[in-house]
Interface confidence: low
């Protein structure tokens, strides 16, 4: 079976800097190399307005949803039809394709699945899902997200969002 | 060496129902979908169906489509083909297979489905 | 259905190629395999399966490429023994697919 992990699934990241999602995976079936593909799709909330706005009827909605299921990710957790899907690259042995969206920008996999962005830009906010196929092994968790939010620097907003963490916390 | 041994095949009567077994040996099985294949006599290769490796995934040809099962038992390394109401045009050569893009063949069990 | 050639010949120690084209996509890919039958009613060998890669115990005449959506079986030094019916397979997303075989003659 495939096992597909993003070790760090948030990111802020300032407008024009370069950023990497990482991701791994496992695999029990070695003998050839996966397609790792990147997709991304738009936030299904906006991500930037909300943390601007804490006490909103939307925000204090959500917070309920999530008291009743703690997994539940409002921004992340809605139907493809109601929001921008895009296949960003994919990687088959050495060969990286760009998605046509993409094609221009200096985006690459590197390693064995991870994305890099050597400068972001404004639209690149959302959730980049990292998937993992081989024909030869159909079986297991191949798919696992990051979320990446771009922030421009303005007076006006902070570098990093209220309650948005830019990795992983260690207790 | 990938080994892949059928049977249950033989003389069928038409609504009538086979199960053919797979067994398989020499490979890591529950890393591998397993499919099965039939040729009718004189013709080419159709697909009838497949399972994934943990056996959460089935799927069918249209021509089996509500008359097949597959399933496997990945402690015994083996999979099963249950086919009910059969007919006529369900005669031929059950080949046992391994991968989603076939890479191992199994020698075949002969069915023939006549009064 | 996969579409390859009804059959192809050619002489000892020539080229042969072999294609086929109307797989399925799998997250954008297309994959193929090549399977030799000898004779109707005896088991089938894979001669090449995702693409290109080939069995150990096949011989390296035997290889397999991709371009686009068609796959091609290429036979460098085709030996009498190579003559029988080969198919293609691939897949969609809900069922497994054969070409109806190419008779190659030698």
């Known amino acids: 079976a495939i096992q597909v992990t993003v070790p760090d699934p948030y990111h802020v990241v300032i407008l024009f800097q370069p950023v990497t999602l990482h991701c791994t995976y496992q695999m029990s079936n070695t003998l050839t190399a996966p397609i790792v593909i990147w997709k991304y799709k738009s936030f299904c909330r906006d991500r930037v307005a909300d943390a601007f706005s804490p006490a909103s009827v939307d925000n204090q909605l959500n917070a309920q949803l999530a008291a009743g299921n703690p997994g539940y990710n409002p921004y992340v957790e809605c139907q493809d039809s109601v929001r921008t899907v895009r296949v960003v690259a994919t990687k088959q042995g050495n060969a990286v394709t760009l998605g046509d969206y993409y094609q221009g920008r200096r985006i690459t996999i590197t390693g064995n699945a991870d994305l890099t962005f050597e400068q972001t830009a404004w639209g690149d906010s959302g959730v980049y899902y990292c998937s993992v196929v081989s024909a030869q092994d159909l079986d297991g968790n191949n798919e696992a997200y990051a979320e990446l939010i771009v922030l421009g620097r303005t007076s006006e907003a902070p570098e990093l969002l209220p309650g948005f963490r830019a990795g992983p916390l260690e207790d | 060496a990938v080994t892949l041994d059928e049977s249950g095949g033989g003389l069928q009567t038409p609504g009538g129902a086979l199960s053919l077994v797979c067994e398989a040996s020499g490979f890591d099985f529950s890393s591998h979908e397993m499919q099965w294949v039939r040729q009718a006599p004189g013709k080419g290769l159709e697909w009838v169906a497949g399972i994934s490796g943990a056996g959460s995934s089935t799927r069918y040809g249209s021509a089996v489509q509500g008359r097949a099962t597959i399933s496997r038992d990945n402690g015994q390394s083996t999979v099963r083909l249950q086919l009910n109401n059969l007919r006529a045009e369900d005669t031929g050569t059950y080949y046992c297979a391994r991968g989603s893009l076939i890479d191992a063949w199994g020698h075949g069990t002969e069915v023939i489905v006549s009064t | 259905a996969l579409t390859q050639p009804a059959s192809v010949s050619a002489n000892p120690g020539e080229t042969v190629k072999i294609t086929c084209s109307g797989g399925?996509?799998?997250?954008?890919?297309?994959?193929y395999s090549w399977h030799q039958q000898k004779s109707p009613g005896s088991a089938p060998v894979t001669v090449i399966y995702e693409n290109n890669q080939r069995p150990s115990d096949i011989p390296s005449r035997f290889s397999g490429s991709k371009s686009g959506s068609t796959a091609t079986l290429t036979i460098t030094g085709v030996q009498a023994e190579d003559e029988a019916v080969y198919f293609c397979g691939s897949y969609d997303s809900s069922a497994g697919l054969f070409g109806a075989g190419t008779t190659l003659t030698v």
């Open positions: 399925g996509s799998y997250y954008g890919s297309y994959y």
